[in-house]
Interface confidence: medium
């Protein structure tokens, strides 16, 4: 079995304020079992943007149906972008663990920049 890769193909994405930003991420394998999470920033201070397993993220929608069997697309769309949303977003695969899931692999990150809303 090939080793899992987390693919974030875009180095950067630029979106006008008020629009939606699509951040693309795919896994190359279903193994190991465990959830996907999206974070803004890296390290201890990173901000959770989306958790596949639990939580309420009203501005985030998944691009494909994550519950679909064999789905490998974990792209998200964030609505109503503001300048405060700028930063680097990481798609992170976790391995199912007990009691806590363990971070397994991160994508290379996609930098979101926000342009002023066209007047």
């Amino acid at each position: 079995e090939d080793e899992l890769q987390v693919i974030q193909p875009e180095k950067s994405v630029s979106v006008a304020a008020g629009e939606s930003a699509t951040l693309r991420c795919a896994m190359t394998s279903l193994i190991p079992v465990g959830p996907i999470m999206w974070f803004r920033g890296a390290g201890a201070g990173r901000e959770l943007i989306y958790n596949q397993k639990e939580g309420h993220f009203p501005r985030v929608t998944t691009v494909s149906e994550l519950t679909k069997r064999n789905n490998l697309d974990f792209s998200i769309s964030i609505s109503n972008i503001t300048p405060a949303d700028a930063g680097t977003y990481y798609c992170v695969k976790f391995r199912k663990g007990s009691p806590d899931d363990v971070e397994f692999k991160s994508g290379a990150g996609t930098e979101l920049s926000v342009r002023a809303k066209p007047s």
Epitope: K11, L72, K105, A108
Partner: antibody, heavy 120, light 112 residues
Framework: QVQLVQSGAEVKKPGSSVKVSCKAS????????ISWVRQAPGQGLEWMGG????????NYAQKFQGRVTITADESTSTAYMELSSLRSEDTAVYYC?????????????WGQGTTVTVSS | DIVMTQSPLSLPVTPGEPASISCRSS???????????LDWYLQKPGQSPQLLIY???NRASGVPDRFSGSGSGTDFTLKISRVEAEDVGVYYC?????????FGGGTKVEIK
Amino acid sequence: QVQLVQSGAEVKKPGSSVKVSCKASGGTFSSYAISWVRQAPGQGLEWMGGIIPIFGTANYAQKFQGRVTITADESTSTAYMELSSLRSEDTAVYYCARGVPRGDLGMDVWGQGTTVTVSS
Amino acid sequence: DIVMTQSPLSLPVTPGEPASISCRSSQSLLHSNGYNYLDWYLQKPGQSPQLLIYLGSNRASGVPDRFSGSGSGTDFTLKISRVEAEDVGVYYCMQAIESPLTFGGGTKVEIK
């Protein structure tokens, strides 16, 4: 183990188009990129573009923009590279390879190559 | 586009002796995640290229341990600790940090 099998050699006239196929077998196809790399006789390697089938959209090296089209058919695990407005300088061996810009593991599987000769 | 420059162009080697190939990039291949997005490939005569090293220093599956990659940022080296006859061919470095992927011009390794 994943294998990439390419279509056979082609001889084309200047100004025409060629479409090369690359069929994957033995592993996941959808979320790996398929890149296309060419090698002119006696020359080095040149990346033309690539596609991640699960996303559908391809990206291309500027040099080939407007002349190359890369597509993928998830149902048959096959990627295609079509190059139009052929000229003699396009005579080369065209390779497909599994690997993606910003992927972790390099282009780890390569097709056997397809020789395209452009001659009047 | 990122420009990749390899040296030497040609490298005559003696079996059993070490060999070293240099690769320079026009901008840093070191990502904030700590990885260098630099791969090494070998194209043996009449064959498709094969992956040797990924992420700067990681040997690909099935690659003998006499091959090693090192370096960071813009300067990278591929070393063969003891060259064998089967190692002849053209070696290419390639940056994988951003599109378009770009290759070095190649280093031809041949037996003296």
